[in-house]
């Protein structure tokens, strides 16, 4: 199935040009999306091209500027946030990135009623996190690992926590491992729906071993970066959840929410918090051995000003075939009765589906079913539930938005997006206004992305928000590669693949093949999305065939495929890439003497193991920032899939699955190893150990390090990286420069 048919007619061929590496590095063909910043059922904010903050009212069709670009520029603001009472705006400047989600910034409060910045009791700097209450204009913020509260922007702050300490105690913000592997946010505090209470997490990292690496900078002596970072089997952060009454915060102070007894009996994690009402909160906990999750619904006891989590309101989710959930344990979406909820988890056939839980998980009512997966619940209203799935036409790499009418019996299901722009749009996400009065659909491909606004009752399209016309025009004279998504059936396993083919692809010719792999648990590479990137260039200009294969361990095709890698990472992911390559060779258009593999992060691990598989299939390959031993990676991620590196658990496979153990097998391949020295995520240690093992085995290889660069290798390093990898591949494939 050709997803991006070439628009090239023979007569036009002369005027068409191939993609260049420069196009990719300059971001010439990047696309835009439009996500409304909803502020009510029918209003949203958007930052205009000239940086004014504009309020749009869908029903009146009117728009007006609430904050001028001049005001934004006066403090060099790069972001903003309107208070729910619309009296104030915070302006964010001096953005300074920390880890994946976290950053610090300076915040200014602008008073919309008098057109002036709030003076007196200004916010300290830099702030680690700041947010408005959901109602009114209270502010909560984190400064130097402590949480502060302001009843109004001009008021003096009330200090909620006092024990915050850098790298030791984190209040209201996650430590490294919770940020990266559990919460996937920069914050760890949550306002109740009407702003009466503020819940927050406290992470105690006192006993966590520290990763230390040099940051070379420009000084005479390098700095040492220290991060409490629990590797597999190491001591983990200790988490506690507190809730404080923000109206009268001083008298009672923060009250700790009790941990369910079955969780507290051994090491555990907190995984998420969901407010149900102002006086009911839902916490999710996870055992360190991540196959048991407990959802606990807690109620405020006014007389004692405490939170009570009765055992009758504990719901256990357990996996007997793998870990709990997908990548994360799913979060509940509560219905209007404030006790029952909708949640995605595995059904009896091993497919992740929406279930309705009213009393116990055992009595859950299954809402969706089939040999496909429900992926996200967007919104539940009185009469509708909106969700995304990959059901349509049985393509796991698609995403469509569905509406189930829950107000009627039996519930009826409607695909909102399946037939809207069928060729162009097969991968959607959505953003809903209050009460789902309106919603935006953002289509990511396979055609050029488009964002549209819709009526929440009728699903009618109201207007196009962004259609990337400039991009469409710019691509008119570009010879884009062809893309196809198909599947291989091998030994009862379905291997979906995406193949990117040169523009003038001829099945009777032979082409060099590059496998791009990620392959991490619960990931998906074969997706019906638009992209003009490095591999597009390699196909368009350099005439390579590029393939992406989703093997065992990947997501959204059922638990059998997903949990196949449980406790044995590095085996089936590699086998399935190799199997796919053999099938591609059988197709007849691959030059089997010119096959390469490359990957980044988990993909670097898989590509390294594939190169060292001893199959003789690969001539060369690249590993960027690879994991080399699971003992070197973060506890939360690693143990989810591998258990513990102890004798009585899974130490043997931890040892067997290292890249270093296969050093000898690199002798007959060309290997390029790349890593940033300031990688806080996959530590440089991983590549250092590979290099050491290769040297000790007297195996030649190529390497490149990027000084002071993290896991993303951003900025000028990106250009250098892709230029370097291009040279390496062209040399490997004997392509002229």
């Amino acid at each position: 199935i050709v997803l991006r048919p070439s628009r090239v007619h023979n007569s036009e061929e002369n005027t068409m040009r191939a993609l260049t590496l420069k196009d990719i590095l300059n971001g010439t063909f990047s696309y835009k999306t439009f996500f409304p910043n909803w502020i009510s059922g029918q209003e949203y904010l958007h930052q205009s091209a000239d940086n004014n903050i504009v309020l749009y009212n869908i029903e009146t069709g009117q728009s007006y500027t609430i904050l001028s670009n001049r005001t934004m520029k006066s403090v060099n603001a790069s972001n903003y946030g309107l208070s729910p009472d619309r009296q104030f705006v915070y302006l964010e400047s001096d953005y300074s990135k920390l880890w994946r989600y976290s950053y610090t910034a300076t915040y200014y409060i602008y008073d919309l009623s008098n057109g002036e910045f709030v003076r007196g009791n200004e916010l300290p700097r830099p702030i680690q996190y700041l947010c408005w209450s959901p109602v009114g204009s209270k502010l909560a913020y984190v400064y130097q690992n402590n949480i502060y509260l302001k009843q109004r922007p001009g008021d003096p702050p009330f200090q909620i926590t006092f024990n915050g300490r850098e790298n030791k105690i984190f209040n209201g913000i996650p430590d490294w491992v919770y940020e990266e592997e559990m919460l996937a946010t920069k914050y760890a505090l949550w306002w109740s729906p009407n702003g009466k209470f503020l819940a927050y997490a406290e992470f105690n990292d006192t006993d966590i071993p520290v990763i230390a690496y040099s940051y070379y900078g420009d000084e005479q002596y390098p700095r040492t970066i220290n991060i409490p970072y629990p590797k597999a089997g190491a001591k983990n952060p200790v988490v506690r959840i507190f809730i404080i009454d923000t109206t009268y915060p001083a008298y009672v102070g923060p009250q700790e929410v009790p941990v369910p007894a079955m969780i507290a009996s051994s090491d555990y994690y907190f995984s998420w918090l969901t407010w149900v009402t102002d006086e009911r909160v839902c916490l999710q906990w996870l055992k360190r051995v991540q196959n048991v999750s407990v959802l606990s619904i807690c109620d405020f006891r006014e007389d004692w000003q405490t939170w009570d989590c009765p055992k009758t309101q504990e719901h256990i989710e357990e996996s007997r075939t793998g870990w709990a959930g997908g990548f994360f344990v799913s979060t509940p979406v509560f219905s209007y009765d404030a006790i029952s909820y909708y949640k995605i988890f595995s059904d009896k056939d091993g497919y992740k589906h929406i279930h309705y839980i009213k009393d116990t998980v055992e009595n859950a009512i299954q809402i969706t079913s089939g040999k496909w997966e429900a992926i996200n619940i967007f919104r539940v209203t009185q009469d509708s539930l909106f969700y995304s799935s990959n059901e349509f036409e049985e393509y796991p790499g698609r995403r469509n938005i569905y509406r189930i009418s829950i107000g009627s019996y039996p519930p009826s299901k409607k695909c909102v997006t399946c037939h809207l722009r069928k060729e162009r749009c097969q991968y959607y996400t959505a953003s809903f206004s209050d009460y789902a009065k309106y919603y935006a659909l953002v289509c990511y491909g396979p055609g050029i992305p488009i964002s549209t606004l819709h009526d929440g009752r009728t699903d009618q399209e109201i207007k196009i928000l962004e259609e990337n016309k400039e991009l469409e025009n710019a691509l008119k004279n570009i010879q884009l590669p062809k893309e196809e998504i198909k599947k291989l059936e091998v030994d009862e396993i379905t291997l979906w693949y995406k193949m990117i083919l040169p523009p003038q692809f001829d099945r009777s010719k032979k082409y060099p093949l590059l496998i791009q792999v990620y392959g991490g648990p619960c990931s998906q590479s074969v997706r019906s999305v638009f992209a003009v990137n490095w591999i597009s260039y390699l196909a368009s200009k350099e005439g390579m065939v590029i393939a992406l294969v989703d093997g065992r361990g990947t997501a959204f095709q059922g638990d059998k495929l997903l949990y196949a890698v449980y406790r044995k990472l590095g085996v089936y992911e590699v086998e399935d890439q190799i199997t796919a390559v053999r099938k591609f060779i059988e197709m007849g258009f691959i030059d089997e003497k010119r096959i390469a593999i490359w990957g980044w992060s988990y993909g670097g691990y898989v590509s390294s193991l594939a190169l060292a598989s001893g199959t003789g299939l690969f001539k060369c390959g690249i590993a960027v920032a690879p994991v080399s031993s699971w003992e070197y990676y973060a506890s939360v991620y690693t143990e989810r899939f591998m258990g513990l590196p102890t004798k009585d658990d899974n130490l043997e496979h931890y040892k067997n699955s290292t890249v270093m153990a296969r050093a000898e097998y690199f002798r007959n391949v060309d290997y390029l190893l790349i890593h940033g020295t300031a990688d806080d995520n996959v530590h440089f240690q991983n590549s250092a150990q590979i290099a050491k093992a290769l040297v000790n085995a007297q195996v030649d290889f190529q390497a490149m390090w990027y000084s002071d660069q993290n896991h993303g290798l951003s900025g000028l390093s990106t250009n250098h990286l892709y230029t370097h990898m291009t040279h390496f591949l062209k040399q490997c494939f004997s392509l002229s420069d």
Epitope: Y251, W304, Q305
Partner: antibody, heavy 122, light 107 residues
Framework: QLQLQESGPGLVKPSETLSLTCTVS??????????WGWIRQPPGKGLEWIGS???????YYNPSLKSRVTISVDTSKNHFSLKLSSVTAADTAVYYC??????????????WGQGTLVTVSS | DIQMTQSPSSLSASVGDRVTITCRAS??????LNWYQQKPGKAPKLLIY???SLQSGVPSRFSGSGSGTDFTLTISSLQPEDFATYYC?????????FGQGTKVEIK
């Protein structure tokens, strides 16, 4: 120097309502730093917290007494009051009013009245 | 409710002795513990707040320590005016609760 002074009848009949007032002098009751509380001590026994009030009227009560207790504040008179209904002999105690500092946390009672003995008897 | 248990209930000591009174909370109260001294017929008097902070005007022979569930009041050198009953009190939650008291008597 801050002073607190309890006043009210020293004898109350069973089933009736005990009413006490605490007058604050040498400082304002309308401060965001303090709550104003009532604590009692039965003869020869330990201390029991009854409840506390903020100048705005926000109250916290001991759950064991909550159904019978009302604490109110009158900022214009710079005093606060305690009402305890349906009293029995078990409510016989010395009743203290006290100032509870709440900022910086935690709360602690730094100024106390001298106490007034209330006897419940027919 | 958080129960506060003091030990001992009473003790006899001489002037100049070092006296230690312990207070245990039924659940963690962080550092939110206060100590009071009460003499017969008088209102309690604040000695220590926040587990270890000495109230202004209180002699430095009084000190407090602890956090979580276990706390200690220490009188480094007992003076004649220190013979009294001592109460601990938690302010971590509602209801505010006091220990049952420790009576310090002359040996």
């Amino acid at each position: 120097q801050l002073q607190l002074q309890e006043s009210g009848p020293g004898l109350v009949k069973p089933s009736e309502t005990l009413s006490l007032t605490c007058t604050v002098s040498g400082g304002s009751i309308s401060s965001s730093t303090y709550y104003w509380g009532w604590i009692r001590q039965p003869p020869g026994k330990g201390l029991e917290w009854i409840g506390s009030i903020f100048y705005s009227g926000n109250t916290y009560y001991n759950p064991s007494l909550k159904s019978r207790v009302t604490i109110s504040v009158d900022t214009s008179k710079n005093h606060f009051s305690l009402k305890l209904s349906s009293v029995t002999a078990a409510d016989t105690a010395v009743y203290y009013c006290a100032r509870e500092i709440i900022e910086p946390r935690p709360g602690y009672f730094d100024y106390w009245g001298q106490g007034t003995l209330v006897t419940v008897s027919s | 409710d958080i129960q506060m248990t003091q030990s001992p209930s009473s003790l006899s000591a001489s002037v100049g002795d070092r006296v230690t009174i312990t207070c245990r909370a039924s659940q963690s109260i962080s550092k939110y513990l206060n100590w009071y001294q009460q003499k017969p017929g008088k209102a309690p008097k604040l000695l220590i707040y926040a587990a270890s902070s000495l109230q202004s005007g209180v002699p430095s022979r009084f000190s407090g320590s602890g956090s979580g569930t276990d706390f200690t009041l220490t009188i480094s050198s007992l003076q004649p005016e220190d013979f009294a009953t001592y109460y601990c009190q938690q302010s971590n939650s509602i209801p505010r609760t006091f220990g049952q008291g420790t009576k310090v008597e002359i040996k």
